[in-house]
């Protein structure tokens, strides 16, 4: 039998990009950290 029309079974979860800056002293500037939230 042919399949009936359905969307993809995979749900889309938006990834969260969280930026943070940490002060590590005037001579080293700032470290920029990046956290990427995975698919829930």
């Amino acid at each position: 039998d042919a399949e009936f029309r359905h969307d993809s079974g995979y749900e889309v979860h938006h990834q969260k990009l969280v930026f943070f800056a940490e002060d590590v002293g005037s001579n080293k500037g700032a470290i920029i950290g990046l956290m990427v939230g995975g698919v829930v």
Partner: antibody, heavy 120, light 112 residues
């Protein structure tokens, strides 16, 4: 709110063509993901799926009836149509239209049904 | 076609009883997208069918939690934990994975 209502001739003679209309409100068949199907039920018997049409005019038919069925839509008038050619007494039934969408992928909304009697 | 076989065809109950309806499909109704499109509808006399359960086990909005669906592949079950008077009617399972979409013959839930 979403409503659907079927209309038809009520009575036909064998060999005539049945024309059914499903008039709906609360959604548009020009909206991506929308679809409407037809289901029938002979009195005191079970349900039989007939045909289905999507917003992009993609159509599906029950193969056992496909040669006799034509589903179509008028998006601007919020209507879906079903034609069944060469009706016989076996086509005597209540005919329902119902909506499903790609995100609400089930028949959540049904019309009240319209009754057809085929008799000579 | 996918044949949907419901048992029993008639189910006499007393109010407050648990009721269980079985639905078996003649082949797997797992869609290629990974979902199983098995639905349950209740039809009362003179009314249109009403959706209870979709995708095997998901209760539709407003459906009491005494209704639950389960199963996989070809074997599915609808359970009503405590039957109330408003639950009486004919229950249909329905698959929308394969064309033609097909209903079971129905199970009549009635009072003993």
């Amino acid at each position: 709110q979403v409503t659907l209502k079927e209309s038809g001739p009520g009575i036909l003679k064998p060999s005539q063509t049945l024309s059914l209309t499903c008039s709906f409100s609360g959604f548009s068949l020009s909206t991506s993901g929308m679809s409407v199907g037809w289901i029938r039920q002979p009195s005191g018997k079970g349900l039989e799926w007939l045909a289905h049409i999507w917003w992009d005019d993609d159509k599906y038919y029950n193969p056992s009836l496909k040669s006799r069925l034509t589903i179509s839509k008028d998006t601007s008038r919020n209507q879906v149509f079903l034609k069944i050619t060469s009706v016989d007494t076996a086509d005597t039934a209540t005919y329902y239209c119902a909506r499903r969408t790609t995100t609400a992928d089930y028949f959540a909304y049904w019309g009240q049904g319209t009754t057809l009697t085929v008799s000579s | 076609d996918v044949l949907m076989t419901q048992t029993p065809l008639s189910l006499p109950v007393s109010l407050g009883d648990q009721a269980s309806i079985s639905c078996r499909s003649s082949q797997s109704i797992v869609h290629s997208n990974g979902n199983t499109y098995l639905e349950w509808y209740l039809q009362k006399p003179g009314q249109s069918p009403k959706l209870l359960i979709y995708k095997v086990s998901n209760r539709f909005s407003g459906v009491p939690d005494r209704f639950s669906g389960s199963g996989s592949g070809t074997d599915f079950t609808l359970k009503i934990s405590r039957v109330e008077a408003e639950d009486l009617g004919i229950y249909y399972c329905f698959q929308s994975s394969h064309v033609p979409l097909t209903f079971g013959a129905g199970t009549k839930l009635e009072l003993k």
